[in-house]
C-alpha cells in the first residue's frame, strides 16, 4: 500500500491554516486500525500518533517552510511512509503604512499622553515598526511583533515634542514608510505680567499710558483683556504670541488698580494688580502719577 | 504618477510681490513636505526652505526669511511660495520639489518658474 | 552655514572614458543620528534637476549603474565610469544634515 501527505492549502499564506491529510488511496482506513503521524524535516508535529489521518495546523508562519511527511502504522506494527512534500509559506510584504496619533489630529495638551500608531494594511509574519522623530528623522523605537498595529506612547508631553513624526514597517521586503504627521503641543497660558508704560517718569492728565500685558508661555492666539478696578477696558488679540498693549489717556479718574488677564482656550490666568496713584508735588501746577 | 506642475513665467516690477504655485498630483500631498529652491541665471542651486502641507508650518533658510513665504492649501494639494520687495537679484528659476523621508532625497521637481524682476 | 566646494568645476570627457568629480565639505556632515544626507543631482541642459546618489552611496532607482557615490565626513566622490552622451550636463552635491542644506556651486560636464 502506498501513503501519500496531501496539503490543503498546498502554497499557504503566513497565518493562514493548513490541513495535513495522511491518504491511502488503494486500502480503506476503515479495514485496518491504523496510527497516524506527521513529521516536518525530523521532526514529529501535533500529538504525536494519532488514529486521524488529519493534522490541522491553526496558522503557518514563514519558519514553517519546509519537507513534511506522514506515517501510517497497522496493529500489526507495519510502518508505512509518505514521500516528502515540500510545503513553502508565503509572505505578504508589509503596504500602505500609516501612523495616527491618540489623541486624533495631533494637537495635543502639554503633560497629556501622546499615542503614535503606526499601522499596514497589508502584511505577515513579524513586522518590525520603527518610529522617527523630525524630517531628517531621529529612531524613537522600534518594536517587533506579529500584527498590523504598533504603539509608540509618550507619557508626558512637552513642547519640545512639537515635531513633524513618521513610522517605517518592514518584514523582510525592504522598509515602507509612512507619511508625516505633526504634533502641535497646546499650551495653557501662564500668569501674565502687566506692565504700565508712560512718556516720562511723573505721567501727567492727557499722557498716553500704555498697559503692556504679556504671558511667556502659551500657544497662540492668546487674547488678552485690560481692567482697571475689575471693569473692563478693551481686549487685544496677540495671533502669533508675544504680548499686547492698550492704550489710555489719562483723566484723574484712571487712579487705581490695573490688571490683565490672558486667555488662549486653554484656561485663562490674570496678572497681578498695578496700582496707580495720583500725586500733587509741591509747588505743582498739574496733577502727576505714579506707579 | 507623481507630478509637480509649476505656474508660468512672471514679469514683475521692482517692490512688488510675486506668488508662485506648485501643484500636486499622484500622491498625497499632506504625507511629504514640500521644498523650494532657487536657481539665478547662469548659476547654481540655493535652498529655500520647506512646508510642511499637513499643518502649513514653514522652516526656512536665514538667507530668506522674510523675503518668502510659504504656504499650502491642502484642498487644492497647491503649495505657495510668495516673494516680497522684489530686486533684481531676485531674477531667478524657482522650483518646488518632495523630498521623501527616511530615504532623504528629493525624488520629484517641478518644472521650474522664471521670475524676472524689471522696470 | 556649511560650504560644499566641488572642484573641477568644468569637466571635459571622452566617451566611453571614466569621469570623477570630488565634493569637499567646510565641517562634518554627518548627522546626530549617525547618517550621512549627501545627494548627488545632475542638471541637464533646460531640465529640472534630477536625483542620481543619496545618503552618499546608495544609486536612486532607475540610476544607471555607471554610477557611483563613495566618501565620508567632509570628504566625497562621485564616479562614471564610462560616460555616455545622455550624462553630459551640471552636477551638484548637496548635504540635508544640517540646515541650512546646501549646494556646491556645480560642475559642469561636457563631451570633448
Known amino acids: 500500500a502506498e501513503l501519500f501527505l496531501i496539503a490543503s492549502p498546498s502554497h499557504p499564506t503566513e497565518g493562514s491554516p493548513v490541513t495535513l491529510t495522511c491518504k491511502m488511496p488503494f486500502l480503506q482506513s476503515s479495514d485496518a486500525q491504523f496510527q497516524f503521524c506527521f513529521f516536518r524535516d525530523t521532526r514529529a508535529l501535533g500529538p504525536g500518533w494519532s488514529s486521524s489521518p488529519k493534522l490541522q495546523i491553526a496558522a503557518m508562519w514563514k519558519e514553517d517552510t519546509g519537507s513534511y511527511w506522514c506515517e501510517a502504522q497497522t496493529m500489526a506494527s507495519k510502518v508505512l511512509r509518505s514521500r516528502r512534500s515540500q510545503i513553502n509559506v508565503h509572505r505578504v510584504p508589509v503596504a500602505d503604512v500609516s501612523l495616527e496619533t491618540q489623541p486624533p489630529g495631533g494637537q495635543v495638551m502639554e503633560g497629556d499622553r501622546l499615542v503614535l500608531i503606526c499601522s499596514v494594511a497589508m502584511g505577515t509574519g513579524d513586522i518590525t515598526f520603527l518610529w522617527y522623530k523630525g524630517a531628517v528623522g531621529l529612531n524613537l523605537q522600534s518594536k517587533t511583533q506579529r500584527s498590523l498595529t504598533a504603539e509608540y506612547e509618550i507619557p508626558s508631553v512637552r513642547e519640545s515634542d512639537a515635531e513633524q513624526y513618521y513610522c517605517v514597517a518592514e518584514n523582510g521586503y525592504g522598509p515602507s514608510p509612512s507619511g508625516l504627521v505633526s504634533i502641535t503641543v497646546r499650551i495653557p497660558v501662564s500668569r501674565p505680567i502687566l506692565m504700565l508704560r508712560a512718556p516720562r517718569a511723573q505721567a501727567a492728565v492727557e499722557d498716553v499710558l500704555e498697559l503692556h500685558c504679556e504671558a511667556l508661555r502659551g500657544s497662540p492666539p492668546i487674547l488678552y483683556w485690560f481692567y482697571h478696578e475689575d471693569i473692563t477696558l478693551g481686549s487685544r488679540s496677540a495671533p502669533s504670541g508675544g504680548g499686547a498693549s492698550f492704550n489710555l489717556s489719562l483723566t484723574e479718574e484712571h487712579s487705581g488698580n490695573y490688571s490683565c488677564e490672558a486667555n488662549n482656550g486653554l484656561g485663562a490666568q490674570r496678572s497681578e494688580a498695578v496700582t496707580l496713584n495720583f500725586t500733587v508735588p509741591t509747588g505743582a501746577r498739574s496733577n502727576h502719577l505714579t506707579s | 504618477q507623481v507630478q509637480l506642475v509649476q505656474s508660468g513665467a512672471e514679469l514683475v516690477k521692482p517692490g512688488a510681490s510675486v506668488k508662485v504655485s506648485c501643484k500636486a498630483s499622484g500622491y498625497t500631498f499632506t504625507s511629504y513636505n514640500i521644498h523650494w529652491v532657487k536657481q539665478a541665471p547662469g548659476q547654481g542651486l540655493e535652498w529655500i526652505g520647506w512646508?510642511?502641507?499637513?499643518?502649513?508650518?514653514?522652516k526656512y533658510n536665514e538667507k530668506f526669511k522674510g523675503k518668502t513665504t510659504l504656504t499650502a492649501d491642502k484642498s487644492t494639494s497647491t503649495a505657495y511660495m510668495e516673494l516680497s520687495s522684489l530686486r533684481s537679484e531676485d531674477t531667478a528659476v524657482y522650483f518646488c520639489?518632495?523630498?521623501?523621508?527616511?530615504?532623504?532625497?528629493?525624488?520629484?521637481w517641478g518644472q521650474g518658474t522664471l521670475v524676472t524682476v524689471s522696470s | 552655514d556649511i560650504v560644499m566646494t566641488q572642484s573641477p568645476l568644468s569637466l571635459p570627457v571622452t566617451l566611453g572614458e571614466p569621469a570623477s568629480i570630488s565634493c569637499r565639505s567646510s565641517q562634518s556632515i554627518v548627522h546626530s543620528n549617525g547618517n550621512t544626507y549627501l545627494e548627488w543631482y545632475l542638471q541637464k541642459p533646460g531640465q529640472s534637476p534630477q536625483l542620481l546618489i543619496y545618503?552618499?552611496?546608495n544609486r536612486f532607482s532607475g540610476v544607471p549603474d555607471r554610477f557611483s557615490g563613495s566618501g565620508s565626513g567632509t570628504d566625497f566622490t562621485l564616479k562614471i565610469s564610462r560616460v555616455e552622451a545622455e550624462d553630459v550636463g551640471v552636477y551638484y552635491c548637496?548635504?540635508?544634515?544640517?540646515?541650512?542644506?546646501?549646494f556646491g556651486q556645480g560642475t559642469k560636464v561636457e563631451i570633448k
Open positions: 520639489a518632495r523630498r521623501i523621508h527616511y530615504y532623504d532625497y528629493f525624488d520629484y
Open positions: 548637496f548635504q540635508g544634515s544640517h540646515v541650512p542644506w546646501t
Open positions: 512646508i510642511y502641507p499637513g499643518d502649513g508650518n514653514p
Open positions: 545618503k552618499v552611496s
